[in-house]
């Protein structure tokens, strides 16, 4: 830590005196203190001398010596009083700027420590301090107003009793700034606007802040609009509102509107788009494919997006068949509004049954007319398989019927032994039927195909199996020839319950 000579915490001198303050450290040292006149600074290696041969009351202050190279940042200080009978105060600042709830130091330094007992803080022109002003005094630093409030932004003077009369300092202006968390808060309503040409419209831009010093304006396509401003103060916030009223809108009023507010912390802006249309409109769309395929027993949500102006006068979901005349339950239909002119309508179809395949239509109406959007829902089924032995044109034939959706593929297997299902070790022969005959293929129904396997002689210690598979699953049927005829055996696991 540097050492100051003279080694006293305080030094009291008279105006015109010579003052020499010497600081010595291990490394280079430097003096600092309030910028004031008449000081001369001399440095010589590890010592620095601060001197004046004509001290004035303005040299009153705390002078600190630091060692810049010291990692611990040690410093030493000495306080100099230049006691001028005509000047009890050395005011180091004309203005003090602090934020609310900070301590505000009004730096009027007493030039004579003897006067400390008779000091006080007043507002200019002798006015008393505001109620609840909590302050303290230090002869080295001045008056501190604790936890300063915005309302305490005033001009202050420091007062000292000298020979029975009060001597005032020059004034210090205190500016207590509100803590502004950021740029003003903004609202621009509506967030989006659509009007038919000739209708009326209103756009409201409002900004608020804890501090009155902020600007707000509304601009249309980058042109600032001249709109009278309404100002208000409530909930401890200043509010400025700009209202644009349009009695009869036309196409030139359309475009981007931006509400912009700025203060010392920066700028905020928010925008909206105003569309002017010739007539009412109603548009239906879906992000989904209008042709849907779902496995039986699973669920599906059908979603329709509606864009409309003016608003909808009616809407509903309708089942158009072909299986029954049931209609979707209202509780399964759901509507959500994305914004003023866009809505999403959802129809929930949980645990789909075979009779629920078919066409679903969403209908909506507004002054622009009716619109409809239709979905086609086809259910997927795993294959069901059956095999029979028959003679076709005198030849023994195994006939396999497979029913499912999508259309099943058919494979025949011949394996040794009697079994419900051929495994790899038993397989003797495999036949793929690339083109089974389609027996039925109606919209929204299962597809039924038939595959024929001509067998000249049925081997009695063997099993013939028809396997069908599609994207949903697979099914099989094992045919076991028996001396007394033939035996067909569906596998145990194929008990399909939707």
């Amino acid at each position: 830590i540097p050492v100051i000579e003279p080694s006293v915490p305080e030094l009291v001198v008279k105006p015109g005196a010579t003052v020499t303050l010497r600081c010595v450290g291990n490394g280079s040292v430097e003096w600092d203190g309030p910028p004031s006149p008449h000081w001369t600074l001399y440095s010589d290696g590890s010592s620095s001398i601060l001197s004046t041969n004509n001290a004035t009351f303005q040299n009153t202050g705390t002078y600190r010596c630091t060692e810049p190279g010291d990692p611990l940042g040690g410093s030493a200080a000495i306080h100099l009083y230049v006691k001028d009978p005509a000047r009890p105060w050395n005011v180091l600042a004309q203005e003090v700027v602090v934020f609310e709830d900070q301590d505000a130091l009004l730096p009027c330094l007493l030039t004579d420590p003897v006067l400390e007992a008779g000091v006080s803080l007043v507002r200019v022109r002798g006015r008393p301090l505001m109620r609840h002003t909590n302050y303290s005094f230090s002869p080295w630093h001045g008056f501190t107003i604790h936890r300063a409030k915005f309302i305490q932004s005033q001009d202050y003077q420091c007062s000292a009793l000298m020979g029975g009369r009060k001597v005032m300092s020059i004034s210090i202006r205190l500016k207590v700034q509100k803590v502004i968390p950021g740029p003003p808060a903004l609202t621009l309503v509506p967030a989006e606007l659509v009007r038919i040409r000739g209708e009326a419209a209103q756009i409201v831009c409002s900004a608020s802040s804890v501090d009155v010093n902020f600007d707000v304006f509304l601009q249309h396509n980058n042109t600032k609009l001249a709109i009278p401003q309404q100002s208000d103060f409530h909930n401890n916030r200043y509010q400025k509102v700009l209202t644009l009223n349009l009695d009869q809108v036309d196409f030139q009023h359309a475009g981007n509107y931006s509400c912009v507010a700025s203060n010392v912390q920066g700028k905020h802006s928010t925008s909206m788009f105003f569309r002017v249309v010739e007539s009412a409109y109603l548009n239906l769309s879906s992000e989904q494919n209008l042709i849907q395929e779902v496995t039986v027993g699973e669920g599906l949500n059908l979603k329709v997006m509606v864009e409309a102006y003016p608003g909808l006068q009616g809407f509903n979901w309708t089942y158009l068949g072909p299986f029954s005349d049931h209609q979707p339950e209202p509780k399964l239909a759901n509507a959500t509004t994305k914004d003023t002119y866009r809505h999403t309508f959802t129809l929930s179809l949980p645990r789909l049954k075979p009779s629920e395949a078919g066409r679903y239509s969403f209908l909506a109406r507004n002054p622009g007319g009716w619109r409809a959007l239709t979905f086609e829902l086809t259910l997927r089924y795993p294959p069901e398989v059956s095999v029979i032995w028959t003679f076709i044109n005198g030849s023994g034939t195994l006939l396999c019927a497979a029913s499912g959706y999508p259309q099943p593929n058919v494979t025949w297997l011949q394996c040794s032994g009697h079994t419900d299902r051929c495994d790899e070790a038993q397989v003797l022969q495999v036949w793929d039927d690339p083109y089974p005959e389609v027996l039925s293929q109606e919209p929204f129904h299962k597809v039924t195909v038939q595959s024929l396997l001509t067998v000249e002689t049925l081997e009695h210690n063997q099993t013939y199996e028809c396997r069908a598979h599609n994207s949903v699953g697979s099914g099989s049927w094992a045919f076991i020839p028996i001396s007394a005829g033939a035996h067909t055996h569906p596998p145990d696991e194929f008990l399909f319950t939707p």
């Epitope: 430097e30 003096w31 600092d32 203190g33 309030p34 910028p35 004031s36 006149p37 008449h38 000081w39 001369t40 600074l41 001399y42 601060l50 004509n54 600190r64 630091t66 410093s75 180091l92 600042a93 004309q94 203005e95 003090v96 700027v97 602090v98 900070q102 505000a104 130091l105 009004l106 730096p107």
Partner: antibody
Framework: QVQLQESGPGLVKPSETLSLTCTVS????????WSWIRQPAGKGLEWIGR???????NYNPSLKSRVTMSVDTSKNQFSLKVSSVIAADTAIYYC??????????WGQGSLVTVSS | QSVLTQPPSASGTPGQRFTISCSGS????????VNWYQQLPGTAPKLLIY???QRPSGVPDRFSGSKSGTSASLASSGLQSEDEADYYC???????????FGGGTKLTVL
Amino acid sequence: QVQLQESGPGLVKPSETLSLTCTVSGGSISSYYWSWIRQPAGKGLEWIGRIYASGGTNYNPSLKSRVTMSVDTSKNQFSLKVSSVIAADTAIYYCARNRLGIYDYWGQGSLVTVSS
Amino acid sequence: QSVLTQPPSASGTPGQRFTISCSGSSSNIGSNTVNWYQQLPGTAPKLLIYSNNQRPSGVPDRFSGSKSGTSASLASSGLQSEDEADYYCAAWDDRLNGPVFGGGTKLTVL
């Protein structure tokens, strides 16, 4: 080593407020006085004012009515605002450390142009 | 109009001695010390001399300063090409309660 860095908009419209911030690194803002000095193109230096960590300020009388300085010790920053700017306020603005009236550390300067 | 008066320009050849003057009044140079700042092209000013004649560390000893009455001067014993810069004098002004600067002297090394 103490370093100072000015930041703020380079272009300000007439009648608006010029705002600059000086960030101090390599040392604490708390123990010194800090100043703003400006230099119009091709001209000399002009002292704008000074501020102490406690918020105490002194301004050049010729600019006093338009200048506000503030300090944020938590961010090691001090700032300058000049209101109602005119073309004559176009200059390079420097922040500097003021030690007993000696400006021993300077920022690199920030050019502010006042123009519509 | 600057409070302190400096010649707008000065020139010299390498190795030559140069002097820049700075004139003030009793409220500034007459009662307070003078500081000098060097501003190399395109850079910020740098402290060159403080308290009339003190050099900060890193400043070559060819630079020196002096003060007499209400005037001060900056001198260099051997001009070098890197000395080409603007030089400003400054002093505390009692009336302003702040610093005042000279208008600057542009030094050209020929």
